[in-house]
Structure formats: C-alpha cells, structure tokens
C-alpha cells in the first residue's frame, strides 16, 4: 500500500511540476522592470523567453515576439533549450509513469516491468526538474549580471545635458514558478524512484515470516531456508512458502492475476 501511495503521490507531484514548467516557459514575466530607485515611468516593461511586453499605464498592453533566432543572446537560447528539454522529458516521463502506476492494470504486465517503467519515469522527472531549475537559474544569473551593469551606468548622458532612462530588469514571476515547478518535478521523480524499489520483485523484499508447522506432515525442502531468508538467488524455491511468505504489497496485487482488463 505504501509503495502504491508513494508512486501515486510521485506521479501527482510530477504532474503539477511539469504543468508549472510549461506555464513558466510560456509566461511573459521572466524579467520585469525594476521600479525601485528608478524614475517613475508611465510604462511597465516585462520580458519572457519568446516575447517582450510593455503595459502602458492607460491599460494598453503591447507584446512583440522575438522574430529572430540568430540575433538572440546565446544564454537566452540555452534557457529556451533547457526548458523545452525539461518539458519533453517530463511529458515522456508522465506517459511512461501512467502505464507504470500500480493502480492501472494493463494485460498481464509483470511487476518487474512496472518497476522498470517507474524507475525510468522517475529518472526522467529528475532530469526534467534539473533542466527547469538550471534554465531558470541561468536566466536569473543573466538578470543579476545585467542589473548591476545597468546600475553602474544608470544614466547615460549626452554631454551631461540629456538623461536617458536606463530600464533595469529584475526577477519576474516566471522565475519563481519555474524554480518551484522544477523542484516539484524533482521531488516527484525521487518519489517514483523510491516507489520503484518497493515494486521490484526481489528476494530482499520479503519480510521476516514465522512459519508454524502443524504436525509432522510438513516437509522442509533443502532450498527453503535459502529462499525464505533471502540469501542466494534460487528462483525455483522462491515461492515455497506461498501461503505465509507474502508481503503486504503482494497481497494487494495478487487478485490482479485472475482479473480482466
């Protein structure tokens, strides 16, 4: 039961995380105009990965896409790539994890196959989360660098006579959404990996069981101790004590073998 809960929770957390990564990637507020210690302007600038926007105080908002690939900074391209890779991996991970969920029965899929799929999706979620966190962090670093550069020359003068308003940008909402979403996807991935260990039908999964001999009729086969204690890999003797040596998860999943899809 605990493994199923861990797997299910990991899936839900990852799903929320990936939805957040997609939202962050699409958002326009990756960087927003810094209003502190700046001349009060009647326009508010903010920028995303795909377009830059200006909201006038009158309420009119105008957005312009970056209709160039070669003219964009390499860092911005790198951030775009990281976010897209994160989304693609996350989406594939979600697809794989749906089939890996213990509560969903597909034909006569072995627990070992579900365990492998759970591990695969978990790793995908971890990498997806790391991609998002990396992408957002690279962009944040770029902002910090540019912020201090523009602070150093806050006003560029023409012979000291004319002042130009230097628009400084600070962290936008999308960065925080991206960080949180990346973190959630990462956590979800870790949970999936933990759930995978509980799903794998290994000898080490068997709990210590006490066996009660009812009379002298019970014959202990030579390989029995070996299998029940978990030492060695004698698969033939694995289910010698089927009546007693079943883990909590096996009990729950047992009827599935006689079920229909």
């Amino acid at each position: 039961m605990a493994v199923t809960a861990c797997q299910g929770l990991g899936f839900v957390v990852s799903l929320i995380g990936i939805a957040g990564i997609i939202a962050a990637t699409c958002m326009d507020q990756w960087s927003t105009q810094d209003l502190y210690n700046n001349p009060v302007t009647a326009v508010f600038n903010y920028q995303g990965l795909w377009r830059s926007c200006v909201r006038e105080s009158s309420g009119f908002t105008e957005c312009r896409g970056y209709f160039t690939l070669l003219g964009l900074p390499a860092m911005l391209q790198a951030v775009r790539a990281l976010m897209i890779v994160g989304i693609v991996l996350g989406a594939i991970g979600l697809l794989v994890s749906i089939f890996a969920l213990k509560c969903i029965r597909i034909g006569s899929m072995e627990d070992s196959a579900k365990a492998n799929m759970t591990l695969t999706s978990g790793i995908m979620f971890i990498v997806s989360g790391l991609c998002a966190i990396a992408g957002v962090s690279v962009f944040a670093n770029m902002l910090v660098t540019n912020f201090w550069m523009s602070t150093a020359n806050m006003y560029t003068g023409m012979g000291g006579m004319v002042q130009t308003v230097q628009t400084r940008y600070t962290f936008g909402a999308a960065l925080f959404v991206g960080w949180v979403a990346g973190g959630l996807t990462l956590i979800g991935g870790v949970m999936m990996c933990i759930a995978c260990r509980g799903l794998a039908p290994e000898e080490t999964n068997y709990k210590a069981v006490s066996y009660h001999a009812s009379g002298h009729s019970v014959a202990y086969k030579p390989g029995g101790f070996k299998a029940s204690t978990g030492f060695g890999s004698n698969t033939k003797n694995k289910k010698i004590y089927d009546g007693g040596a079943r883990t909590e998860d096996e009990v729950q999943s047992y009827p599935s073998k006689h079920d229909y899809v």
Epitope: V40, V43, V54, E56, S58, F60
Partner: antibody, heavy 117, light 113 residues
Framework: QVQLKESGPGLVAPSQSLSITCTVS????????VHWVRQPPGKGLEWLGV???????NYDSTLMSRLSISKDRSKSQVFLKMTSLQTDDTAMYYC???????????WGQGTTLTVSS | DIVMTQSPSSLTVTAGEKVTMRCRSS????????????LTWYQQKPGQPPKLLIY???TRESGVPDRFTGSGSGTDFTLTISSVQAEDLAVYYC?????????FGAGTKLELK
C-alpha cells in the same frame, strides 16, 4: 459616443478648497484612466494628475500636496480636489481620457475656475 | 522634473506652405521595451479643448489629415505640416507621456500672414 463633462463651483475665495467633477459616458472608468489638465488664461497647458483604471494615482510634483483625485465607478464620475487655492490657480480645468501611448484622445469642454476674493 | 521645450514659440505662415515645429525633452522619451517614443502632439484652437493629433511620436490619430507628420526619437521631435490650411491655425503642444509628471511644452502658435 465618448463624452466627458466637467462641473465646478466657478468662483472660489483664496485659501479655500475646491472640488471639480468629471462625469463620463460612452466608456468605463474600470478600463480607462482619466487625467486632469488646466490652462490659465492666455497660457499653456499644465498637467495636474491622473487616476488610472486600477485606481492608482499620479500627480504633478509641485501640486502634489494640494491635489487629490478620486473616482466613483458606479456614477462614472472622477473628482479633483484642490486645497489652499491661490489666485494663480485661476484657469480652465479639463478632464481627459487616456488611451494608446498614454495620450489623451478625448477631452471635456472644460470648466472655468476663478479664485478671487 | 522633465522639461519640454518647444520652438519656435510662434510661426507666421502663408497657406500651402510647409511648416516644421520642434519639441525637445530634457530626458529621453524612448522606451526600449517596445521601441516606441512616448511623445504626443495636440492641436488647440481658440475656445476649444486640445485635440489629439499624433501619439508615439509618429502615429497619426484616426481622422487626422495626412498632411500632419510626426518624427524624431529620444529627445528631439518634429511636427511637420506639409501644406498649411486655414483651419490649421492653432496652438500646437507636445507632451511627454513617458516620465511623470506628464509635462506639456509651452506651445507653438501658428498664425497666417
């Protein structure tokens, strides 16, 4: 169609306060900002302040301490309140709607204010 | 505060003539975010409220004749009337719509010879 109409007391004694009302029609105050501009006799235009669609305000720095702009959305009215009036506050007071580029696309006909004892 | 300077203060012209008036701001009105200049031109005839002519320094308001052209960027702006008509006689004001306070220029008065 879009209309703005100012109404005020006309004559006010020095050191008194005044309230001018701008009643709008043809648009919503929740979607557009309304500015106040004055023009002393024979002189140029002077921007006083604005109340934006969201309710935030901005004022001319020299008049900020004496100015207050508010609105009643339900009545489609914008109010300009000014304290400690002096004779040089005598002017034609206009309200105007803000649109693209924060420019003023529609103006009221104006209301004359005379500050005199 | 930002200062808007208009020149000349008055212009005497003949009908059909090309007219150019200038407006200079003490700070740049260019916004890098949308590559627009936040300068507006108004026309005011005697006894009337001002009328919007041009916004974003060069965008003509609908209904404004195409003889009116706005140009310029940053701190220096120009309003050109390609062929002055009798109905164009008025005072022309430029306004900063970028940095508070949204100051107006002193105006350029256009008169007929």
């Amino acid at each position: 169609q879009v209309q703005l109409k100012e109404s005020g007391p006309g004559l006010v004694a020095p050191s008194q306060s005044l309230s001018i009302t701008c009643t709008v029609s043809g648009f919503s105050l929740t979607s557009y900002g309304v500015h106040w501009v004055r023009q002393p006799p024979g002189k140029g235009l002077e921007w006083l302040g604005v109340i934006w669609a969201g309710g935030s305000t901005n004022y001319d720095s020299t008049l900020m301490s004496r100015l207050s702009i508010s609105k009643d959305r339900s009545k489609s009215q914008v109010f300009l309140k000014m304290t400690s009036l002096q004779t040089d506050d005598t002017a034609m007071y206009y309200c105007a709607r803000s649109l693209y580029g924060n420019s003023f696309d529609h103006w009221g006909q104006g209301t004359t204010l005379t500050v005199s004892s | 505060d930002i200062v808007m300077t208009q020149s000349p203060s008055s212009l005497t012209v003949t009908a059909g003539e090309k007219v150019t008036m200038r407006c200079r701001s003490s700070q740049s009105l260019f916004n890098s975010g949308n590559q627009r200049n936040y300068l507006t031109w108004y026309q005011q005839k005697p006894g009337q409220p001002p009328k919007l002519l041009i916004y974003w320094a060069s965008t003509r308001e609908s209904g404004v004749p195409d003889r009116f052209t706005g140009s310029g960027s940053g701190t220096d702006f120009t309003l050109t009337i390609s062929s002055v008509q009798a109905e164009d006689l008025a005072v022309y004001y430029c306004q900063n719509n970028y940095i508070y306070p949204l100051a107006f220029g002193a105006g350029t008065k256009l008169e007929l010879k």
